[in-house]
Interface confidence: low
Amino acid sequence: SEVEYRAEVGQNAYLPCFYTPAAPGNLVPVCWGKGACPVFECGNVVLRTDERDVNYWTSRYWLNGDFRKGDVSLTIENVTLADSGIYCCRIQIPGIMNDEKFNLKLVIKPAKVTPAPTRQRDFTAAFPRMLTTRGHGPAETQTLGSLPDINLTQISTLANELRDSRLANDLRDSGATIRIG
């Protein structure tokens, strides 16, 4: 059965997933997808890393930790009830059927109190390469290398004020962790 994690509407959700690189900087590709882990790859990919960089991510989904050390925990920004469900963290270890798969269940609870509406922060000043998306829907993605000359979608990421590092630390020990090598 899946490990269950909870968050309230409007909060950031944190889904822990870790591996230990065989050697420092010797990274393994990882994908995160919405839905249980299929036989291969990830379904409905929301974020992907390769041996050097995060090379694909979608709006509201980002890596908060140091993925160069194997912390590939997923942060989902400003969750809604629609974000509930199973998420797959797949550590794509080279070799046939070597992948490590972790299914994590996210349960979103209604907010205890409805916060007063606030003006959306514009992240341009602090994170100008990753801007807040103005539009909505499936077009809110960024991908590098998979399509020629696509427009980079402006998304928010790595925002200090959106971090909940205490939650991250609390969940680190109970997260999915494997050792490689």
Partner: antibody, heavy 121, light 107 residues
Framework: EVQLVESGGGLVQPGGSLRLSCAAS????????IHWVRQAPGKGLEWVAD????????EYADSVKDRFTISADTSKNTAYLQMNSLRAEDTAVYYC??????????????WGQGTLVTVSS | DIQMTQSPSSLSASVGDRVTITCRAS??????VAWYQQKPGKAPKLLIY???FLYSGVPSRFSGSRSGTDFTLTISSLQPEDFATYYC?????????FGQGTKVEIK
């Protein structure tokens, strides 16, 4: 083998213009960020501008904003720095360097050899 | 802009010495700090990325560490080819900013 080669530097009068080129080989600039960094004689390193060629998103240092324009041609795997209204304080060796889109990991892992820009009357 | 305050600005050391260079960020930069080595007339070379990762091909005598907003580059046993200028850099926010540099000279 990854390589970055700058060209286009030279002597120019104050108020003049130059266009620097950064020709990349061994990798696709569309998957990276290209940065320009300069170094005045005997001084430290100063970041100037960057571009995400796959989409054209650009950023500039305040000191060059509205005077310099960074661009890229992915078909030629080349980035450019158009420098207008040049001032004496723009005199420096200009380097292009390769970086990464995911900001947390955007260290500059390959650099060109540099091209010298001298602004003097 | 985030200031990277690097110290010392220069130091004299002998071959075999342990050398430590520090950089303090004016605000949180997480682990988004790199260290570069530059020799006269040459382009900088990446040594350490993400505060503590040794870049490919860099000798293991180089190491990096982080404590809050303080970052350290250590050369465990200085070699003749290590005499150069070293720069730290934060790449957490725009503009990326460099420290002033530390020149490591022969004693």
């Amino acid at each position: 083998e990854v390589q970055l080669v700058e060209s286009g530097g030279g002597l120019v009068q104050p108020g003049g213009s130059l266009r620097l080129s950064c020709a990349a080989s061994g990798f696709n600039i569309g998957k990276h960020v290209i940065h320009w960094v300069r170094q005045a004689p005997g001084k430290g390193l100063e970041w100037v501008a960057d571009i995400v060629p796959n989409g054209g998103y650009t950023e500039y240092a305040d000191s060059v904003k509205d005077r310099f324009t960074i661009s890229a041609d992915t078909s030629k795997n080349t980035a450019y720095l158009q420098m207008n209204s040049l001032r004496a304080e723009d005199t420096a060796v200009y380097y292009c360097a390769r970086g990464y889109v995911y900001r947390m990991w955007d260290s500059f892992d390959y650099w060109g050899q540099g091209t010298l820009v001298t602004v003097s009357s | 802009d985030i200031q990277m305050t690097q110290s010392p600005s220069s130091l004299s050391a002998s071959v075999g010495d342990r050398v430590t260079i520090t950089c303090r960020a004016s605000q949180d930069v997480n682990t988004a700090v790199a260290w570069y080595q530059q020799k006269p007339g040459k382009a900088p070379k990446l040594l350490i990325y993400s505060a503590s990762f040794l870049y490919s091909g860099v000798p293991s005598r180089f190491s990096g560490s982080r404590s809050g907003t303080d970052f350290t580059l250590t050369i465990s046993s200085l070699q003749p080819e290590d005499f150069a200028t070293y720069y730290c850099q934060q790449h957490y926010t725009t503009p990326p900013t460099f420290g002033q540099g530390t020149k490591v000279e022969i004693k």
